[in-house]
């Protein structure tokens, strides 16, 4: 195909791919009609003057995962049709000024995963048609004012995984078309007021894994089109009352892995489109009434691994669309009987790893669609009669690692569990803690005849009548109580893919496979 170099493969579609450690220079001659050229995994260390001179029709050029450390300023001369240029995963420390001169059609420039120490305004001043600029995974310590001033058509800018300690409030001011800005995994400690004011079309802002301690009250006030805001794994200890006030399009907000002690009233809203709110791994101790009441479309609320000891009965007011509520690994001892009454569409609730000693009999009264309830590793000795009766869709109920008191009061629960064993899962079953003579025996098959009679008087209607089998033998303890130790590394809330990918560490928010999707 018009002279394909021996080290390369050339397809009919004018695509050329050159790979292999034996390649130490740009192969020649390259087919004059090549439109796509990939040079991958070679030992090329430098690009000299005009190695692509005879392939002026080239549209896409990928020079990735090589040993490339030096580029001559005229290396890309005569590539006026080039739209996509990737130099990612090389060893570039310096970019020569004028390197991209003449690349008038360039739309995507990928410089990620190199060793770049600085960028200058002159580097990109010729790239007026650039839409995507990837600079993540370099060693950039600061971005000079004017660096992006000529990139007025830019829609995606990735500066993540660098060593940025501060950002000038003027550096993004001309990027009115920017839709995605990623600054994750840097060393930013604060972001000046006005930094994002010019980004009126911004849809995604990734600030996670920095060292941000304080957010300016009006930091996001001009970003009315923002849909995804990632603030997780920073040092944020408080949220200014109005910081999220002007974000009507926001649908995902991650704040996990910060130092939030309280959620100030009205902080979330109005955000009519917010679907997911991630608040795990903070220091929140209580939830007042109406704290989420502006989040009418919220479907996922993750509050696990905080220090919540009190939830006001109206804390979840307004969350009529909520599907997932994670409250596991907190310090809850009591729940008011009204606390979940507004959550008509709730499907999954995780309350494991708390200190709950009892549950109100009507705690799930209005939550008829519940499919999964996690109650393991609490201080429950019994459950109110009929607590699960109306939950026709319940298919997962975890009750193990509680100090069940197997006296005659436990019979209605025992009988209900007997009929609903599949819902308990097979990994670990609830076992008796007291009286001592039945400790460690399965709650489901225990012979309550040998237990101590109860003096407790039930207050609410009983479970549906089910047979009690007094002749069921007492079994020795064959059930090992599973450890409830969880993985404590937080879930990556962000990768460089536009779609967020979730690892399989579902334990962080206590969801099932189906829930985490």
């Amino acid at each position: 195909y018009h002279g394909c170099p021996s080290e390369c493969t050339c397809s009919r579609a004018s695509q050329v791919e050159c790979t292999g450690a034996r390649i130490v220079a740009v192969p020649t001659p390259l087919p004059w009609n090549a439109m796509s050229l990939q040079i991958l995994n070679t030992h090329i260390t430098e690009l000299n003057e005009s190695p692509f001179l005879n392939i002026s029709a080239l549209i896409a050029l990928r020079i990735e995962k090589n040993e490339l450390s030096r580029i001559t300023p005229g290396a890309f001369r005569n590539l006026g049709s080039l739209r996509y240029l990737s130099l990612a995963n090389n060893k570039l420390q310096v970019l020569p000024i004028g390197l991209f001169q003449g690349l008038d059609s360039l739309e995507s420039l990928l410089l990620s995963s190199n060793q770049l120490l600085q960028i200058q305004p002159a580097h990109f001043s010729q790239c007026s048609n650039l839409k995507e600029l990837q600079l993540h995974g370099n060693h950039l310590e600061y971005i000079p004012d004017g660096a992006f001033d000529h990139l007025v058509g830019l829609t995606k800018l990735n500066l993540g995984k660098n060593s940025l300690t501060h950002i000038s409030p003027r550096v993004f001011q001309h990027l009115g078309n920017l839709q995605v800005l990623r600054l994750y995994e840097n060393r930013l400690t604060d972001i000046p007021m006005g930094t994002f004011d010019g980004l009126v079309n911004l849809q995604e802002l990734a600030l996670q894994q920095n060292q941000i301690g304080l957010l300016s009250p009006g930091l996001f006030h001009n970003n009315h089109n923002l849909q995804r805001l990632y603030l997780s794994n920073n040092h944020i200890s408080q949220l200014p009352p109005s910081v999220f006030m002007q974000l009507p399009q926001l649908n995902r907000l991650t704040l996990f892995g910060n130092s939030l002690k309280e959620l100030s009233p009205g902080i979330f809203g109005p955000m009519p489109n917010l679907r997911e709110l991630w608040l795990y791994d903070n220091h929140i101790s209580s939830l007042p009434d109406n704290v989420f009441s502006n989040l009418r479309q919220l479907q996922v609320l993750i509050l696990s691994r905080n220090q919540i000891s009190f939830i006001s009965p109206g804390a979840f007011n307004g969350l009529t669309e909520l599907r997932e509520l994670s409250l596991h690994t907190n310090a809850l001892q009591d729940l008011d009987g009204n606390v979940f009454r507004m959550l008509a569409n709730l499907q999954n609730i995780s309350l494991q790893n708390n200190r709950l000693r009892q549950l109100p009999g009507n705690i799930f009264a209005n939550v008829n669609g519940l499919m999964a309830i996690q109650l393991q590793n609490n201080q429950l000795e019994n459950l109110p009669l009929g607590i699960f009766d109306h939950l026709g869709k319940l298919c997962e109920l975890r009750l193990y690692d509680n100090p069940w008191r197997c006296d005659s009061d436990i019979l209605p629960l025992r009988n209900w569990l007997l009929l609903n064993q599949p819902r308990l899962g097979t990994d670990t079953v609830p076992v008796c803690f007291s009286p001592a003579n039945v400790r460690g025996q399965s709650l489901i098959i225990i012979n309550v005849n040998v237990a101590v009679p109860s003096v407790h008087v039930p207050e609410v209607p009983s479970y549906p009548e089910t047979p009690w089998y007094p002749d069921t033998p007492s079994y020795p303890d064959t059930t090992s109580v599973s450890s409830t130790t969880e993985l404590t590394s937080p879930v990556e809330d962000y990768t460089d893919l536009t779609t967020i990918q979730v690892t399989d560490d579902r334990s962080v928010w206590g969801m099932t496979q189906a829930q985490s999707g």
Partner: antibody, heavy 118, light 107 residues
Framework: QVQLQQSGPELVRPGASVKISCKAS????????INWVKQRPGQGLEWIGW????????KYNEKFKGKATLTVDTSSSTTYMQLSSLTSEDSAVYFC???????????WGQGTLVTVSS | DIQMTQSPSSLSASVGDRVTITCKAS??????VAWYQQKPGKAPKLLIY???YRSSGVPSRFSGSGSGTDFTLTISSLQPEDFATYYC?????????FGGGTKVEIK
């Protein structure tokens, strides 16, 4: 319907203690927090604290720590408040209250007048 | 502690008058404010919760508004049975606190 019935008026000496009660009916007593509120004659209202009858857990206004002690008897659906080391400042009407669907006081007892006088 | 400053402390009005009572919180309490009516020798009665929601059985002439730090109780047309003392209360953070009260008297 929810009802909170409080014990009658008390006349007590300075330095003494008094224990007043609040009997709940019309709902499952152990499932909902009970709060106590103080009102001095001709004055405003002060929140003393809450108790969760199902566990006996309490939370107090710092101002009333050491002064008020909240307890519960689930068998009689009754909450108690003991006031100790009484002074004339403790002369007041004390109300027990139950929250509604939020932390507002939807239901009130009729009040118990405590008079501290020698 | 959050201070709830109520004003006026008293007012004189006639039947049919429009009466407005304000309450200012010393810090942001969102919409977590309730209003109560109390008559002599009686327990307070809940009128308004979550700043603007009328409690069941409360006449429509009573309305509440506000959020953050500034709240208002309005009686659109004062009736003879409305002469009483009115209290605001914040329940956003512990300790829960009340305003000093507004006594509505007959002119």
């Amino acid at each position: 319907q929810v009802q909170l019935q409080q014990s009658g008026p008390e006349l007590v000496r300075p330095g003494a203690s008094v224990k007043i009660s609040c009997k709940a009916s019309g709902y499952t007593f152990t499932d909902y927090y009970i709060n106590w509120v103080k009102q001095r004659p001709g004055q405003g209202l002060e929140w003393i604290g809450w108790i969760y009858p199902g566990s006996g857990n309490t939370k107090y206004n710092e101002k009333f720590k050491g002064k008020a002690t909240l307890t519960v008897d689930t068998s009689s659906s009754t909450t108690y408040m003991q006031l100790s080391s009484l002074t004339s400042e403790d002369s007041a009407v004390y109300f027990c209250t139950k929250w509604g669907y939020g932390a507002w006081f939807a239901y009130w007892g009729q009040g118990t007048l405590v008079t501290v006088s020698s | 502690d959050i201070q709830m400053t109520q004003s006026p402390s008293s007012l004189s009005a006639s039947v049919g008058d429009r009466v407005t009572i304000t309450c200012k919180a010393s810090q942001n309490v969102g919409i977590n404010v309730a209003w109560y009516q109390q008559k002599p020798g009686k327990a307070p009665k809940l009128l308004i919760y979550s700043a603007s929601y009328r409690s069941s059985g409360v006449p429509s002439r009573f309305s509440g508004s506000g959020s953050g730090t500034d709240f208002t109780l309005t009686i659109s047309s004062l009736q003879p049975e409305d002469f009483a003392t009115y209290y605001c209360q914040q329940y956003n953070s512990f300790p829960y606190t009340f305003g000093g009260g507004t006594k509505v008297e007959i002119k």
